[in-house]
């Protein structure tokens, strides 16, 4: 099919960075300023993304690739290709509709993004709390009494943080 299409389509060989110009009898023309075509055989060039406001330019647009944006300090990217910028909060906080709010007692957030997550429940593993949790840090579980045989000493590190923005399972 691809070979058939390319034999039939006079535009199939215009290189990336150009478009097949119907206004000029289907010759290849360069993409105009502030536009790009990342693949060959395009009949139009796409408008370059503009990184404005809370977005800043991470990579300039070229004739063959779109601009890439990230977020200004105090914000972080969300969505594919950084389609949104979300406000950072402090550790020990989460972003709500009303802004940054402290984590409720029994939850923590050790990042500037994402939600507050419950402290680890040490007793589920038959362990005790060695270090209390805070708004910024999970609890540290200590050994269960059965582990305290001579020569045995263990401290269970907190469970690895889940991906930002994911609620606990």
């Amino acid at each position: 099919f691809e070979r058939t299409r390319s034999l039939q389509d006079p535009c199939s060989n215009c290189p990336a960075g150009t478009f097949c110009d119907n206004n000029r009898n289907q010759i290849c023309s360069p993409c105009p300023p502030n536009s790009f075509s990342s693949a060959g055989g395009q009949r139009t060039c796409d408008i370059c993304r503009q990184c404005k406001g809370v977005f800043r330019t991470r990579k300039e647009c070229s004739s063959t690739s779109n601009a890439e944006c990230d977020c200004t300090p105090g914000f972080h990217c969300l969505g594919a290709g950084c389609s949104m910028c979300e406000q950072d909060c402090k550790q020990g906080q989460e972003l709500t509709k009303k802004g940054c709010k402290d984590c409720c007692f029994g939850t923590f957030n050790d990042q500037k993004r994402g939600i507050c997550r419950p402290w680890t429940n040490c007793s589920l593993d038959g362990k005790s709390v060695l270090v209390n949790g805070t708004k910024e840090r999970d609890v540290v579980c200590g050994p269960s009494p059965a582990d305290l045989s001579p020569g045995a000493s263990s401290v269970t590190p907190p469970a690895p943080a889940r991906e930002p923005g994911h609620s606990p399972q």
Epitope: L7, S12, C14, P15, C20, Q26, I27
Partner: nanobody, 121 residues
Framework: EVQLLESGGGEVQPGGSLRLSCAAS????????MGWYRQAPGKRREFVAA???????VYAESVKGRFTISRDNAKNTVYLQMSSLRAEDTAVYYC???????????????WGQGTLVTVKP
């Protein structure tokens, strides 16, 4: 405005050589394929050779090994080096700007006015 201006034609003896030039303007030369065609008296215009922007080339069977197409993007010029010329190569030679940078099943978007090549003893 697209302009294609051929030059280099003339009269030559069989076995001789000629180099045709086609100076192009009015478009982005380096990203487009160019071709040479010819039309002998009383015959249809026929494909001779073509060259892509990437310098891939295609030739008609009748000229393979005798003609060489080349391009100079800095000068916006395409060339046809013709050697071992035969009487049957006598024709008006036309430069063509090809649609979509294609040399496979090429289609001409714009033509030059042609230059006459005559091969006779």
């Amino acid at each position: 405005e697209v302009q294609l201006l051929e030059s280099g034609g003339g009269e030559v003896q069989p076995g001789g050589s000629l180099r045709l030039s086609c100076a192009a303007s009015g478009f982005s030369f380096s990203i487009n394929a160019m071709g040479w065609y010819r039309q002998a008296p009383g015959k249809r215009r026929e494909f001779v050779a073509a060259i892509e922007s990437s310098r891939n080339t295609v030739y008609a069977e009748s000229v393979k090994g005798r003609f060489t197409i080349s391009r100079d993007n800095a000068k916006n010029t395409v060339y046809l080096q013709m050697s071992s010329l035969r009487a049957e190569d006598t024709a008006v030679y036309y430069c063509g700007l090809l649609k979509g940078n294609r040399v496979v099943s090429p289609s001409v978007a714009y033509w030059g006015q042609g230059t006459l090549v005559t091969v006779k003893p």
